[in-house]
């Protein structure tokens, strides 16, 4: 959560001089109370908006519009102070407009803008604008909240933008997954224009318990230029319990752009579809959740071994 | 006003190429993304493929093996070729501008876009496969 | 594939009539749709964008409302220039796809 370069914050428009203010998201109103306030903002919209930079860079912002109330109340308004809240971090950033001429009714309803807070695909922001000065303490609200979710770099127009490029959204691996006889699993997938390693993770379950029962990592050392945009194929051995059906298969790739935090693609192979009698699940079978094995993860390609140090992937 | 056309050969024979080329005046060709959408007789609206002015491409799964999408900035144009042609693939072919400049105030040094689908479409143009 | 689908597929209405049309998506896509007109042999024109934002030009007895799954667009008092065909378009994920239409002829 930031701010585009603050040189370029504007809120002027015709009929008002106005300048945009860092704020420390705590008004003076808040501390030295005025007996008459404004009343609340109307109509609070967030849309998802892109702003081109001049340095080519694309970033997705939150385009925060509202209008005024028509009442009198307009001519104690002395400006509005703008909050991003970040919910999963609770890192919150302000900005205060700061109306320098007395506002007037006219013919159209006033209407504010400002689009200059950027947001981080996936995630999920409070947006409030207060209207200044803030109410005396037991006074009616004047400020307007809403929600605002963000979309992940998979969503159509999300992907060329700058931090979604920077983990690799324009890579399509184009995962196939392959059974094989003997217990075995083949994962091809289209490897990218770079020179890096990748890691394909493998995590089997039953089909009923959402526990890990097996769980392989396989190493892909980097492609050479050649290699590029073609197919790579691993082969897992699969856990020898037949309940442990249901695999989960990632390929995290290790851009430059992104390193350990590259978008990560994902399939899913469901357990075969058996006959009306399901085979029961031999208890014992069942205690380790999954099977420890001796052995490192660094192996090439089509190399059946692998490690199974148990991870968490989210 | 931002205008689109369509260009092309109206004929194709089934196992060939079909050409079309898309020509973008009164506007920039910068910033957008552009569509191919097309629709067979009779039928509804199927959308093809798209390509970012930077030439960035989102495809049709359905049609992803015989599609590619190329744009020509200094021209100010876009094409769509798709291969392998069959009698299905008749259809009015229409180009489309995905994306508005955000206009109001307060941009800065910025320009502003959004992407809510195509707003800007040429008139079509059709295309029958048959030998 | 996000599935789009509409109802009804086509409708009967007189001018004045207040026509609803809805339209479905298989998975939520936040409010990532269009609703598009489209006469014969003409190329579709777009009324409504981001779910309930009315295109510049278009007359205010068009409305969309709706998010996530379930759109409406409402015209409040049909017009003789309104018998069309409207459709819906998620542009949310690729593929963008169309609702299959709603044919609005005269009663």
């Known amino acids: 959560l930031r701010l585009l370069d603050h040189r370029a914050l504007v809120c002027s428009q015709p009929g008002l001089n106005c300048t945009v203010k860092n704020s420390t998201c705590l008004d003076d109103s808040w501390i030295h109370p005025r007996n008459l306030t404004p009343s609340s903002p109307k109509d609070l919209q967030i849309q998802l908006h892109f702003a081109h930079t001049q340095q080519g860079d694309l970033f997705p912002v939150a385009h925060i519009e509202w209008t005024l109330q028509t009442d009198a109340s307009i001519l104690y308004l002395e400006g509005a102070e703008l909050s991003v809240l970040q919910l999963n971090t609770n890192e919150r950033l302000c900005v205060r407009f700061e109306f320098l001429s007395k506002l007037r009714h006219h013919h159209r309803r006033w209407r504010f803008t400002f689009s200059h807070f950027v947001v981080d695909p996936d995630q999920e922001y409070e947006v409030t604008v207060h209207h200044l000065p803030k109410p005396i303490p037991d006074g009616d609200p004047n400020h307007q909240s809403k929600n605002f979710l963000v979309p992940d770099c998979e969503h159509a127009r999300m992907k060329v933008t700058t931090p979604c490029m920077s983990s690799g959204s324009l890579w399509d691996p184009n995962i196939t997954v392959e059974t094989l006889e003997a217990h075995q699993l083949r994962v091809s997938f289209t490897l990218w224009n770079e020179s890096t390693p990748y890691q394909v993770l493998l995590e089997s379950f039953s089909d009923s318990e959402n526990h890990s029962c097996f769980d392989v990592v396989k190493q892909i050392f980097a492609p050479r230029q050649e290699e590029f945009h073609q197919r790579a194929n691993v082969t897992f051995t699969l856990s020898k319990f037949h309940w442990c059906c249901h695999h989960h298969v990632q390929v995290q790739p290790f851009f430059s752009s992104c390193l350990n935090d590259c978008l990560r693609h994902a399939v899913t192979v469901p357990c075969p579809v058996i006959s009306n009698t399901t085979v029961p699940k031999p208890v014992a079978d069942y205690i380790p959740l999954w099977e420890p094995r001796s052995g490192s993860s660094d192996y090439k390609d089509d190399d059946d071994k692998g490690s199974s140090h148990h991870h968490h992937h989210h | 006003q931002v205008q689109l056309q369509e260009s092309g050969p109206g004929l194709v024979k089934p196992s060939e190429t079909l050409s079309l080329t898309c020509t973008v005046s009164?506007?920039?060709?910068?910033?957008?993304?552009w569509n191919w959408i097309r629709q067979s007789p009779g039928k509804g609206l199927e959308w093809i493929g798209d390509?970012?002015?930077?030439?960035?491409?989102n495809y049709n799964p359905s049609l992803k093996s015989r599609v590619t999408i190329s744009v020509d900035t200094s021209k100010n144009q876009f094409s769509l070729k798709l291969s392998s042609v069959t009698t299905a693939d008749t259809a009015v072919y229409y180009c489309?501008?995905?994306?508005?400049?955000?206009?109001?105030?307060?941009?800065?040094?910025?320009?502003?876009?959004?992407?809510?689908?195509?707003?800007?479409w040429g008139q079509g143009t059709t295309v029958t496969v048959s030998s | 594939d996000i599935l789009m689908t509409q109802s009804p597929s086509s409708l009967s209405a007189s001018v004045g009539d207040r026509v609803t049309i809805t339209c479905r998506a298989s998975?939520?896509?936040?409010?990532?749709l269009g609703w598009y007109q489209q006469k014969p042999g003409k190329a579709p024109k777009r009324l409504i964008y981001?779910?309930?934002s009315l295109q510049s030009g278009v007359p205010s007895r068009f409305s969309g409302s709706g998010s996530g799954t379930e759109f409406t667009l409402t015209i409040s008092s049909l017009q003789p220039e309104d018998f069309a065909t409207y459709y819906c378009?998620?542009?949310?994920?690729?593929?963008?796809?169309f609702g299959p239409g709603t044919k609005v002829d005269i009663k």
């Open positions: 378009l998620q542009h949310n994920s690729n593929p963008f796809t």
């Open positions: 009164g506007g920039s060709i910068s910033n957008y993304y």
């Open positions: 981001a779910a309930s």
């Open positions: 390509i970012y002015y930077s030439g960035s491409t």
């Open positions: 998975q939520g896509i936040r409010n990532d």
């Open positions: 489309a501008r995905d994306g508005e400049l955000a206009n109001y105030y307060g941009s800065g040094s910025y320009q502003f876009y959004y992407y809510y689908g195509m707003d800007v």
